[in-house]
């Protein structure tokens, strides 16, 4: 014979558990109905009456089937550096995420507790690792032959233009200046110029060539004495 369907509240069989969307009430010692998301238990069950549920009030919510006496308070309004990606409803909490140009420096279960502006790389430095929702930008010095003349959270180091004749050699924060009307060529468009190890560089064994005397320009200088390199042009 099929087992009879018990209606809440009911006393469970010894050693068995209550069914899905039910809970065991210790006081009544009965299996009782849970309240649906968006509701809470207004009156707990007894041996003869089931749980009485009521809708959550404004600015409160329950996300799961529950038997809590009060709904949870929605989080405070999103701060000026955040955007509300999920509104506070009776069934879900408000979720705040960082606005564009910011990242989450301190996260919480859902959304972000503390946003911080993405680091901007200063001239002479390029973005080596872009920012994400939860991590900051990492800046690295531009390698010889590349430069960045901006303060930006997105700009990478770009190659110096290559000149027939160099008027001013490029350095880490400035492009080369050519004497002719146009450079002979530049690095191929779309090439990635994130700062990276340069296998031909010898800085592990001897002093580094200065960014101001970057090979991409200085080797194309006309014959004769080369112009003095700028001193200490680290960036």
């Amino acid at each position: 014979l099929p087992a009879q369907v018990a209606f809440t509240p009911y006393a469970p069989e010894p050693g068995s558990t209550c069914r899905l969307r039910e809970y065991y009430d210790q006081t009544a010692q009965m299996c009782c109905s849970k309240c649906s998301p968006g509701q809470h238990a207004k009156v707990f069950c007894t041996k003869t009456s089931d749980t009485v549920c009521d809708s959550c009030e404004d600015s409160t919510y329950t996300q799961l089937w529950n038997w809590v006496p009060e709904c949870l308070s929605c989080g405070s309004r999103c701060s000026s550096d955040q955007v509300e990606t999920q509104a506070c409803t009776r069934e879900q909490n408000r979720i705040c995420t960082c606005r564009p140009g910011w990242y989450c420096a301190l996260s919480k279960q859902e959304g972000c507790r503390l946003c911080a502006p993405l680091r901007k790389c200063r001239p002479g430095f390029g973005v080596a690792r872009p920012g994400t929702e939860t991590s900051d930008v990492v800046c690295k010095p531009c390698a010889p032959g590349t430069f960045s003349n901006t303060t930006s959270s997105t700009d990478i180091c770009r190659p110096h233009q290559i000149c027939n004749v160099v008027a001013i050699p490029g350095n880490a924060s400035m492009d080369a200046v050519c004497t002719s009307t146009s450079p002979t060529r530049s690095m191929a468009p779309g090439a990635v110029h994130l700062p990276q190890p340069v296998s031909t560089r010898s800085q592990h064994t001897q002093p580094t060539p200065e960014p101001s005397t970057a090979p991409s320009t200085s080797f194309l200088l006309p014959m004769g004495p080369s112009p003095p390199a700028e001193g200490s042009t680290g960036d």
């Epitope: 080596a128 924060s173 680290g234 960036d235």
Partner: antibody, heavy 119, light 106 residues
Framework: QVQLVQSGAEVKKPGASVKVSCKAS????????IHWVRQAPGQGLEWMGW????????DYADKFKKRVTMTADTSISTAFMELSRLRSDDTAVYYC????????????WGQGTLVTVSS | DIQMTQSPSSLSASVGDRVTITCQGS??????LAWFQQKPGKAPKLLIY???SLQTGVPSRFSGSRSGTDFTLTISSLQPEDFATYFC????????FGGGTKLELK
């Protein structure tokens, strides 16, 4: 919290070399470059150079190019500055400082290492 | 090299005084100028970066400003703990410290 801890004081003879260490903690070592700055007794601050621990790239002030070598060991989050052919006027406190490459510069410093060059 | 000329080299003042220290760059350095405070036997401490930005934890009596290639550090009302040596530092094109200003109690 962010800390840069430098090695202890050194006494060296002219012509010798010295290697100063700077151990970083409290942040991702490879995300910042390390500068070295020195200060002779009663004098101002003098920038010597930087190293990017991630790639080993360096840049040295012209004055020190022929005598300084900056290295880093990422496995122990430590930067090193070696100065060779020491002279008496190299007697100074040597500092390391970190730099994130943004407009915020040298926001954390080591406590300094006194190097005395004397015969 | 870009040279940074800092003045005065020394300065006597009293608690509560308003003090200004200036740094002049030999070339344009945009806003890439920082100010450091150093006390005897201690490492320098960053006060202001990018000309105007106050480093976290630094009291608001410290401020920075600029007019062309002239940069100024102002302490609006000197406190006993402010007596120290101050250095400007340019980091736009290479790196260069100013000569320093020793701020002493009058």
């Amino acid at each position: 919290q962010v800390q840069l801890v430098q090695s202890g004081a050194e006494v060296k003879k002219p012509g010798a070399s010295v290697k100063v260490s700077c151990k970083a903690s409290g942040y991702t070592f490879t995300d910042y470059i390390i500068h070295w700055v020195r200060q002779a007794p009663g004098q101002g601050l003098e920038w010597m150079g930087w190293i990017d621990p991630d790639y080993g790239n360096t840049d040295y002030a012209d004055k020190f190019k022929k005598r300084v070598t900056m290295t880093a060991d990422t496995s122990i989050s430590t930067a090193f500055m070696e100065l060779s052919r020491l002279r008496s006027d190299d007697t100074a406190v040597y500092y390391c400082a970190r730099d994130e490459g943004s407009p915020l510069v040298m926001d954390a410093w080591g406590q300094g290492t006194l190097v005395t060059v004397s015969s | 090299d870009i040279q940074m000329t800092q003045s005065p080299s020394s300065l006597s003042a009293s608690v509560g005084d308003r003090v200004t220290i200036t740094c002049q760059g030999s070339q344009n350095i945009d806003n890439y100028l920082a100010w450091f405070q150093q006390k005897p036997g201690k490492a320098p401490k960053l006060l202001i970066y990018s000309t105007y930005s106050l480093q976290t934890g630094v009291p608001s009596r410290f401020s920075g400003s600029r007019s062309g290639t002239d940069f100024t550090l102002t302490i609006s009302s000197l406190q006993p703990e402010d007596f120290a040596t101050y250095f400007c530092f340019q980091y736009n094109n290479g790196y260069m410290f100013g000569g320093g200003t020793k701020l002493e109690l009058k």
